[in-house]
Interface confidence: low
């Protein structure tokens, strides 16, 4: 129903705490360079205004849209042009163009320093002094670095953060309590960020229909006992929620997500037998839990898929009468039978099925033409299965760091023009798939591996879009979302690349590397590895291993030396010479 005041409606629905958190996230995602204090001031002003509208919905400006209210606030910020350049031009536009303009200026790779975690004692002190401000800083810092982070889910992670601090700050050894728990939250939040970015990319590039297809496949896998009408309803609602969040309508998004969670919990009998434990939780935990609930037990009596989609004499008639519905039922029926497939694979199969019907239903004898369609799925299924087997075998042999290095070499050879920091970030993220997925039971590996890789490669595409340098990457990123991963996997050494000349300073290191945390040391070594491959794209694995082992030995020796500086300055040039010789 229509409300006289949209802002009063959302404030009432969400409550003050969530309302303020979501407005802070929205502002931080739009204006990524502003300080916490600047944004906190705006949030307070918006909240005070919302309260006046709650008291009197007819008060001045209470009838304005949220985009108008928020946009006016952002455009009133002093020094907007100096700090944000052409983003300030958005303020010359009217809604809805102004909001679209803000969205287009969101930066997926803002030049902000990494979010460093303070040491335990300092963190606990500031948390105890003012928990609200502390959590506000967390929301602000994450949101500005991840401008498409799923806002209601970020509130969930903030709640987790809060609970961990409350528990650990009361302990004697705060550090050892906090570190593993906060690392766990950080890892989950980063994965959540790339997954959500993928959903927004799908929505932005291919529209709601593409996202809805993704949702139908995913929901059908999770809720195989729900009927098609139920799955369609859930997919439609989920599409609306994601469209709102991707579009910056965070209050509506969070409100609608809460409604969807409520609906699911009120309709468990027709959706899934696995929802009860989620539904017993408070709102943020409930919605999070529902989003990753385990798959329901598959119905025992499902007939073979061929009956309705290959053997039925009416296939072409049914397809012609309502293409989207017929393809939707195919995707639903196939997905509920295959929780062991990735959503990307299921969408490729549905696309293949659609292409087959398009071709065959125009022929003289359609059944003879489409009769082999299920057999034609085989190579599409085998390809990702082989990918999982090969990569998980390699991960088990090399461990995470070694596996990342293998991927780094592979991807630097595929796209040597891409900047080294981007290649290192991508390889480190892609390499984590081993730890994340290869330890899972066999039937969960494929969906985990492929859908995670697709999300990481989406980030590669987004970063590459800003400064396109590789034709290989452009080719893979231009196609459909579900074809990206197979496209990247199929890339080989870029023969058009002219190798980089050898620069000694690229491989020159100093004693400061010795005191870096392990992760930073790894990144330094991986940076050197990518540069080596750019210098010698056709170097063999054996040659690269020799050089990297020598490099590791050099670091180990010099970091243990009494006079580290002298060791680095004398042994460093020798290492560079040996590297050149090994790769000659």
């Amino acid at each position: 129903e229509a409300h006289k005041s949209e802002i009063a409606h959302r404030y009432n629905d969400l409550g003050e705490q969530h309302f303020k958190g979501l407005v802070l996230i929205a502002f931080s995602q739009y204006l990524q360079k502003c300080s916490y204090d600047e944004h906190a001031k705006l949030v307070q002003e918006v909240t005070d205004f919302a309260k006046t509208c709650v008291a009197d919905e007819s008060a001045a400006n209470c009838d304005k849209s949220l985009h108008t209210l928020f946009g006016d606030k952002l455009c009133a910020i002093p020094n907007l042009r100096e700090n944000y350049g052409e983003l300030a031009d958005c303020c010359t536009k009217q809604e809805p163009e102004r909001n679209e303009c803000f969205l287009q200026h969101k930066d997926d790779n803002p030049s902000l320093p990494p979010f460093e975690r303070p040491e335990a004692e300092a963190m606990c002190t500031s948390f105890k002094e003012n928990p609200t401000t502390f959590m506000g800083h967390y929301l602000h810092e994450v949101a500005r670095r991840h401008p498409y982070f799923y806002a209601p889910e970020l509130l969930y992670y903030a709640e987790q953060y809060n609970e961990i601090l409350t528990q650990c700050c009361a302990e004697a050894d705060k550090e050892s309590c906090l570190t593993p728990k906060l690392d766990g939250v950080k890892e989950k939040a980063l994965v959540s960020s790339v997954r959500q970015r993928m959903k927004c990319s799908s929505m932005q590039k291919f529209g709601e229909r593409a996202f809805k297809a993704w949702a139908v496949a995913r929901l059908s896998q999770t809720f195989p006992n729900a009927d098609f009408a139920e799955i369609t309803k859930l997919a439609t609602d989920l599409t609306k929620v994601n469209k709102e969040c991707c579009h910056g309508d965070l209050l509506e998004c969070a409100d609608d997500r809460a409604e969807l969670a409520k609906y699911m919990c009120e309709n468990q009998a027709t959706i899934s037998s696995k929802l009860q434990t989620c539904c017993d939780k408070p709102l943020l935990k409930k919605a999070h839990c529902l989003s990753e609930v385990e798959h329901d037990t598959m119905p025992a009596d499902l007939p073979a898929i061929a009956a309705d989609f290959v053997e039925d004499q009416e296939v072409c008639k049914n397809y012609a009468e309502a293409k989207d519905v017929f393809l939707g039922t195919f995707l639903y029926e196939y997905s509920r039978r295959h929780p062991d497939y990735s959503v990307s694979l299921l969408l490729r199969l549905a696309k293949k099925y659609e292409a087959t019907l398009e071709k065959c239903c125009a022929e003289a004898n359609p059944p003879a033409c489409y009769g082999t369609v299920l057999a034609e799925f085989q190579p599409l299924v085998e390809e990702p299965k082989n990918l999982v087997k090969t990569n998980c075998d390699l991960y088990e042999k090399l461990g995470e760091y070694g596996f990342q290095n293998a991927i780094l070499v592979r991807y630097t050879q595929k796209a040597p023009q891409v900047s080294t920091p981007t290649l290192v970030e991508a390889a480190r993220n892609l390499g984590r798939v081993g730890t994340k997925c290869c330890t899972l039971p066999e039937d969960q590996r494929l969906p985990c591996v492929e859908d995670y890789l697709s999300a990481i490669l989406n980030r590669v595409c987004l970063l590459h879009e800003k400064t396109p340098v590789s034709e290989h990457v452009t080719k893979c990123c231009s196609g459909s979302l579900v074809e990206r991963r197979p496209c990247f996997s199929a890339l080989t050494v870029d023969e058009t690349y002219v190798p980089k000349e050898f620069k000694a300073e690229t491989f020159t290191f100093h004693s400061d590397i010795c005191t870096l945390p392990e992760k930073e040391k790894q990144i330094k070594k991986q940076t050197a590895l990518a540069e080596l491959v750019k210098h010698k794209p056709k170097a063999t694995a054996e040659q690269l291993k020799t050089v990297m082992d020598d490099f590791a030995q050099f670091l180990d020796t010099c970091c243990k030396a009494a006079d580290k500086d002298t060791c680095f300055s004398t042994e460093g040039p020798n290492l560079v010479t040996r590297c050149k010789d090994a790769l000659a």
Partner: nanobody, 115 residues
Framework: QVQLQESGGGLVQPGGSLRLSCAAS????????MSWVRQAPGKGPEWVSA????????RYAESVKGRFTISRDNAKSTLYLQMNSLKPEDTAVYYC????????GSQGTQVTVSS
């Protein structure tokens, strides 16, 4: 082999009652949500009611709410549908199904409401 066998249908006057049963075998009955679906002559299948695996959560189509009650006995692997205040428009073949599915894997039981 999954088998669902409905019984309890028959001819009843408007306002009367019937209790349908569905005996299940060939699968772990207690692990699955179950539904009743009906099909009137010349019409498509219509979902009537569903119950979750434990029997705690039940759902009904608007047309039968307040008149029909779904229940189950997991020890006996049997699903029930108690139908009160029956109306002529309840006339149909009633099927039990696994999950909330309208695909029918059984013969069904005929319910006719007529004076």
């Amino acid at each position: 082999q999954v088998q669902l066998q409905e019984s309890g249908g028959g001819l009843v006057q408007p306002g009367g009652s019937l209790r349908l049963s569905c005996a299940a075998s060939g699968f772990t009955f207690g692990s699955f949500g179950m539904s009743w679906v009906r099909q009137a002559p010349g019409k498509g299948p219509e979902w009537v009611s569903a119950i979750d695996s434990g029997g705690a959560d039940t759902r009904y189509a608007e047309s039968v709410k307040g008149r029909f009650t779904i229940s189950r006995d997991n020890a006996k692997s049997t699903l029930y549908l108690q139908m009160n205040s029956l109306k002529p428009e309840d006339t149909a073949v009633y099927y039990c199904t696994i999950g909330r599915s309208s695909s029918r894997g059984s013969q069904g039981t005929q319910v006719t409401v007529s004076s």
